[in-house]
């Protein structure tokens, strides 16, 4: 028996369902009574789901997994993982035993988009050219860790005096806070871009200083 899986990682959004594809080629006359299918976490060998002795033994993984029972006899051994969590990320092994056996591993990459950044200034009044200001860009509930980029109004990257922190919450999602310290010119726009490297999703936020008063562009 030869097991085949997708070589590319499966990307799944948090709280959605993912299908880990796995297939084998049944011989003529194959019956489910001959099939032993085991899904497990590759690294820890923790059992996830199994079909043995001619029946679905069910989920051994927080009751969020299912096979496709009607498709098994055709050689479809794929696993459905419901309500994906950050902790589900990793490699899963699909093991198929009929007379002989084979196995293959498929990777699950979990992702969550970052929210549109909110921008804050400190201080936020009585600003004069030459003042040092702190601009904070905050974006929430993303995964995996973001890449943060700052630019001025001319699109020139601002790399000095940037401090970025990323904190995971109880669900494993990251809240990003990036702080830019700049000396104000007469006027200017400062923008931050929060990129999710897996989803290739960019979330933009900006603040424009036009002498007095300061204005924030409307939310898009």
């Amino acid at each position: 028996v030869e097991v085949q899986v997708s070589e590319d990682p499966v990307v799944a959004l948090v709280d959605t369902d993912a299908t880990l594809r796995c297939s084998f080629s049944p011989e003529p006359g194959f019956s489910l009574a001959q099939l032993n299918l085991i899904w497990q976490l590759t690294d820890t060998k923790q059992l996830v789901h199994s079909f043995t002795e001619g029946r679905d033994q069910g989920s051994a993984y927080s009751n969020r997994t299912a096979l496709f029972p009607d498709l098994l006899v055709q050689g479809n051994a794929s696993l459905r993982l419901q309500r994906v969590r950050v902790t589900d990320e990793g490699s899963y092994t699909c093991f198929v035993s009929i007379q002989d056996f084979d196995s293959a591993a498929v990777s699950l990459q979990v992702a969550a988009p970052y929210s549109k950044p909110s921008m804050t200034l400190e201080p936020n009044k009585d600003l004069r050219p030459g003042n040092m200001v702190t601009i904070t860009c905050s974006s929430y509930q993303g995964y995996p860790e973001a890449e943060v980029f700052w630019k001025d109004g001319q699109g020139v990257p601002l790399t000095g005096n940037v401090t970025t922190s990323q904190m995971a919450n109880e669900r494993g999602l990251f809240d990003v806070h990036s702080v830019l310290r700049v000396v104000l010119g007469a006027n200017g726009t400062y923008s931050c871009l929060v990129r999710n490297p897996v989803l290739q999703q960019d979330a933009h936020g900006s603040v424009t200083i036009t002498g007095q008063p300061l204005t924030f562009p409307p939310e898009a």
């Epitope: 009574a33 497990q40 060998k45 002795e53 035993s97 007379q99 002989d100 056996f101 084979d102």
Partner: antibody, heavy 117, light 109 residues
């Protein structure tokens, strides 16, 4: 070409334990199933137990349950069989064998274990 | 637990003759049956798997047949090197457990 090379002969006292190794070369060890089969002098073949390294689980013949432990080290492509509480009846040649293509297609050369006081 | 019974215990034949070895299972094993040859001081050698498929490098004079509970290994014309002990073996479906028959000794008459 896959080969299984076993550790050398052992002489043990009754009540002690023996650990025999079986090193695989060629192929992908984690996708093997390795069994241990013994043969007492002048007797037939007796399956003791086996392990599928990729699953990390071993299972044993009822006769040996509790007395035999089979393990595998994927990093060195080596399977081990440890038999405890040895008695004279355990004197035998111990073989490791790979399950592949519907049968034990590759066998180690055998390890003679003699239990004698 | 499935028990495999081989018969006869000893078979005495001459080179060139046809040998028929039997293996009976206490319950159906489907087609999951293998045959091995073992010579003194050597490890067993796989001859037949899945009841009737010859293993790589096994001469055509060896053939296997049967399904369910009754299986036969036939050697069409015995060569001097064929005199040895022959074992049948089955695999339980899951978890994988294996059983050997007690063996048939094929000796020169």
């Amino acid at each position: 070409q896959v080969q299984l090379v076993q550790s050398g002969a052992e002489v043990k006292k009754p009540g002690s334990s023996v650990k025999v190794s079986c090193k695989a070369s060629g192929g992908t060890f984690s996708s093997y199933a390795i069994s241990w089969v013994r043969q007492a002098p002048g007797q037939g073949l007796e399956w003791m137990g086996g392990i599928i390294p990729i699953l990390g689980t071993a299972n044993y013949a009822q006769k040996f349950q509790g007395r035999v432990t089979i393990t595998a080290d994927e990093s060195t492509s080596t399977a081990y069989m440890e038999l405890s509480s040895l008695r004279s009846e355990d004197t035998a040649v111990y073989y490791c064998a790979r399950w592949g293509g519907g049968a034990f297609d590759i066998w180690g050369q055998g390890t003679m274990v003699t239990v004698s006081s | 637990e499935i028990v495999l019974t081989q018969s006869p215990g000893t078979l005495s034949l001459s080179p060139g003759e046809r040998a028929t070895l039997s293996c009976r299972a206490s319950q159906s094993v489907g087609g999951y049956l293998a045959w091995y040859q073992q010579k003194p001081g050597q490890a067993p050698r796989l001859l037949i798997y899945d009841a009737s498929n010859r293993a790589t490098g096994i001469p055509a004079r060896f053939s296997g047949s049967g399904s369910g509970t009754d299986f036969t290994l036939t050697i069409s014309s015995l060569e001097p090197e064929d005199f040895a002990v022959y074992y049948c073996q089955q695999r339980n479906n899951w978890p994988p457990m294996y059983t050997f028959g007690q063996g048939t000794k094929l000796e020169i008459k």
